[in-house]
């Protein structure tokens, strides 16, 4: 079988060679070939070349479309880890440390406080805040965690909020709040997490984190 295949290949190769040689002879205007024959062979050859070029163009287009699609919709995702802060601010601090995610420069962590996006679209935004508090040591007000948004030219606004009453456990009882939702973000929009008492937030591995994902 293999031998027959080889003979077939050689025969095809010989035919191709004869065909190319004939085109060459047509081009040099050899008298032994009729004009009609030459025209037929030339148009056949032009057809082959056209097909090859069209195929090349199509492949090029497909590839460039794939690239464009990839460029237009790159994965945008971030997951950052809580960072203890000496600042008295109620806005939680985050860091790119541990098992964090920062997909590309289309999302950035700015001033350690906010995740800022460069592209408009729908994003799933989430935060988990673990805190340790005691009823006696804390004020009457509950512990509140807020997921907030600041868009260019607009006031800060609360997107999501959750409240937990303080524990009676001593010295303090651990509790976790999880916030998550889908929101339309504009280019340059920043999201951040605000809490009533940042000193009660737990910064142990996996307890407090914040992130987003473009849908």
């Amino acid at each position: 079988h293999r031998r027959l295949d080889k003979i077939e290949d050689e025969r095809n190769l010989h035919e191709d060679f004869v065909f190319m040689k004939t085109i060459q002879r047509c081009n040099t205007g050899e008298r032994s070939l009729s004009l009609l024959n030459c025209e037929e062979i030339k148009s056949q050859f032009e057809g082959f070349v056209k097909d090859i070029m069209l195929n090349k163009e199509e492949t090029k287009k497909e590839n460039s479309f794939e690239m464009q699609k990839g460029d237009q919709n790159p994965q945008i995702a971030a997951h950052v880890i809580s960072e203890a802060s000496s600042k008295t601010t109620s806005v939680l601090q985050w860091a790119e440390k541990g098992y964090y995610t920062m997909s590309n420069n289309l999302v950035t962590l700015e001033n350690g406080k906010q995740l800022t996006v460069k592209r408009q679209g729908l994003y799933y935004i989430y935060a988990q805040v673990t805190f340790c508090s005691n009823r006696e040591a804390s004020s009457q007000a509950p512990f509140i965690a807020s997921l907030c948004l600041k868009s260019p030219g607009r006031f800060e606004r609360i997107l999501l909020r959750a409240a937990n009453t303080h524990s009676s456990a001593k010295p303090c009882g651990q509790q976790s709040i999880h916030l998550g939702g889908v929101f339309e973000l504009q280019p340059g929009a920043s999201v951040f997490v605000n809490v009533t008492d940042p000193s009660q937030v737990s910064h142990g591995t996996g307890f407090t984190s914040f992130g987003l994902l473009k849908l």
Epitope: T89, S90, V91, N111, K113, Q114, C148, K150, G153, R154, F155, E156, R157, S190, F192, N194
Partner: nanobody, 129 residues
């Protein structure tokens, strides 16, 4: 209530600099969005710059971008406006404004006068040679 008092205005030559201050008293505006507006003679009051209450994010009018800087002190009781490369068209009375975070309105744009709850009396800035 919150009282806002501006200071630092005066006469300055074109290309010069000036720093305005706005002191807040009363219910200290720990969670207030603060802004500067200005009103030139015979013109409407216009937005200059704003700073957000929690993040301290800033927004500027196109006419002052790159020349003016809004900031506040750590206690959030004093607001500043650093004005550089001043031009004659910057001549106006400059007002400090504050908005409570609980303020409810149909618009959330920082450059709209109606979105602010408290106003100072203003300080005059004259840019002339």
């Amino acid at each position: 209530d919150v009282q806002l008092v501006e200071s630092g205005g005066g006469l300055v030559q074109p290309g010069g600099s000036l720093r305005l201050s706005c002191a807040a008293s009363g219910r200290t505006p720990l969670n207030y969005h603060m802004a500067w507006f200005r009103q030139a003679p015979g013109k409407e009051r216009e937005f200059v710059a704003a700073i957000s209450s929690l993040l301290g994010s800033t927004d500027y009018a196109d006419s002052v971008k790159g020349r003016f800087t809004i900031s506040r002190d750590n206690s959030k009781t004093t607001l500043y406006l650093q004005m550089n490369s001043l031009r004659p068209e910057d001549t106006a009375v400059y007002y400090c404004a504050a908005r409570e975070t609980t303020h409810i309105s149909t618009s959330d744009r920082v450059n709209e006068i109606r979105n602010y709850d408290y106003w100072g009396q203003g300080t005059l800035v004259t840019v002339s040679s």
